[in-house]
């Protein structure tokens, strides 16, 4: 017996295109006398969807028989929903008036969202590879979803990233929406096995988000470290020099040995060993015939990795008339050298 209230229990309803939407409404009293009408939108431009009193509404049916006594259920069904039906629907009680009925009380409204699933997120990385300590950008795109509310997260190896910017377009009302996000990722030497994941959560996905991935192996370049080492003498007149090429990625690598600036041998990395972090190691060796040299010998290991400018390490062999004990040493810098008497 309380004054009539118009109750729309559902704040929002999600319906897939082609389905039937049920919009619920009950009135708590029969008084004041007057019809219930349904509108899409509010204000002067609202669109009449159903009028209990009069009119023809082919897509609309009432859930219950409004001619039955004590029936105060004014819920309606709208068939064959399309994205154009999205909006807020109001169940409005009118009071009989002359000449026109007067709006008495409105329900709080039910937002009808015509749901459409987002497309699988596509993650793209930079066009060129980058080295550790550099920041690279990844983009993630997904399209065709509705309603507009959507959540996008970025992960690197399961750890959520925070440095990203996301836009959902268009800003205004639309049949469907697109999301575009750009994340910044700082590369480390350990990122060969890393993955960047873009995760999109949407009401249509029922708690099972869509994921797009990018492997950092496609993005990262880890330049090699070189170590040139003189091995113990194999014979009176031979020295074995090795060039350890460590921790590089990708595998594409060409090594050239130079003796006093002249190309001695060129080879392409083939039988590499893989480290746990996904980088590679490779070793090349050069057997130098010391007796063929009267003067000191400058040995250079020159590596061209993944099309980048060559890096090199050198090692000096000193040829001497006075034999001393043999040993080994390592060239520390490309420009510096370590001398060793060989006899």
């Amino acid at each position: 017996e309380e004054e009539l209230q118009v109750i729309q229990p559902d704040k929002s309803v999600l319906v897939a295109a082609g389905e039937t939407a049920t919009l619920r409404c009950t009135a708590t009293s029969l008084i004041p006398v007057g019809p219930i009408q349904w509108f899409r939108g509010a204000g002067p431009g609202r669109e009449l969807i159903y009028n209990q009193k009069e009119g023809h509404f082919p897509r609309v049916t009432t859930v219950s028989d409004l001619t039955k006594r004590n029936n105060m259920d004014f819920s309606i069904r709208i068939g064959n929903i399309t994205p154009a039906d999205a909006g807020t629907y109001y169940c409005v009680k009118f009071r009989k008036g002359s000449p026109d009925d007067v709006e008495f009380k409105s329900g709080a409204g039910t937002e009808l969202s015509v749901r459409a699933k987002p497309s699988a997120p596509v993650v793209s990385g930079p066009a060129a590879r980058a080295t550790p300590q550099h920041t690279v950008s990844f983009t993630c795109e997904s399209h065709g979803f509705s309603p507009r509310d959507i959540t996008l997260k970025w992960f690197k190896n399961g750890n959520e990233l925070s440095d990203f910017q996301t836009n959902v377009d268009p800003v205004g009302e639309s049949v469907s929406y697109s999301i575009h996000s750009t994340a910044k990722v700082v590369l480390t030497r350990e990122d060969v096995h890393s993955q960047v994941i873009c995760e999109v959560a949407h009401v249509t996905l029922q708690g099972d988000p869509l994921r797009g991935t990018a492997n950092l192996s496609e993005t990262i370049r880890v330049p090699p470290t070189l170590e040139v080492t003189q091995q113990p003498v194999r014979a009176e007149n031979q020295v074995n020099v090795t060039c350890q090429v460590r921790k590089f990625y990708p595998q594409r690598l060409q090594l050239t040995w130079l003796e006093n600036g002249n190309v001695s041998r060129t080879e392409t990395a083939s039988t590499v060993t893989e480290n746990k972090d996904g980088t590679y190691n490779w070793m090349s060796w050069l057997l130098v015939n010391v007796s063929a040299h009267r003067d000191d010998v400058k040995l250079t290991c020159q590596v061209e990795h993944d099309g980048q400018p060559a890096v090199s390490k050198s090692h000096d062999l000193k040829v001497s008339a006075h034999p001393k004990e043999q040993g080994s040493n390592t060239a520390a810098e490309n420009t510096g050298s370590n001398e060793r008497n060989i006899y």
Epitope: E1, E2, E3, L4, S29, L30, I31, P32, V33, G34, P35, Q52, L66, T67, K68, R69, N71, R95, K96, G97, F104, K105
Partner: antibody, heavy 114, light 111 residues
Amino acid sequence: QVQLKESGPGLVAPSQSLSITCTVSGFSLSSYAIHWVRQPPGKGLEWLGVIWTGGSTIYNSALMSRLNISKDNSKSQVFLKMNSLQTDDTAMYYCARGNYLRYWGQGTLVTVSA
Amino acid sequence: NIVLTQSPASLAVSLGQRATISCRASESVDSYGYSYMHWNQQKPGQPPKLLIYLASDLESGVPARFSGSGSRTDFTLTIDPVEADDAATYYCQQNNDDPWTFGGGTKLEIK
């Protein structure tokens, strides 16, 4: 329990204004509409108007220009104001609650006389 | 305004007999499947009391001796059997249209 109680001046001089207060208890004015009805001595009932929970009003068109109904939810009071009273406005004035006038006050007698 | 005409204006019925009161509306008081006609009882010095609402629904606490019927413009209140306590004036009332209106009343006497 639900109670409505009218309080008025009793006697009003012709052409003067009438103010009646309906004080309610046992329910909230934010949930129920209040109607005003009057009954001249020995005669029938006449509906004057209603104030809905939101504060909007409807008046009997025959009296609309002379009537004003208002309320103060926090004080649980509804007010009837009527101006330019004549002798034929002498009546018992009732306030009543809700859609079917289920609950009534005992009424307050207003006599319009010089 | 909808005018409600009650007949008879007064009625004397013997104890235990049936009393029938008629109410005719100047236009239909039916809307959306309901008849917005109600019946009230008023005893001297008291406010009206709701007996029947929506033409035929018995108000809680009202004896089943009271019943209502009718639709559109013609309505009837029946008291069967009449008891001494039923002596009162009975009013029909409509709220299908504004302003709400009452019938002129029917005074019931018990013989």
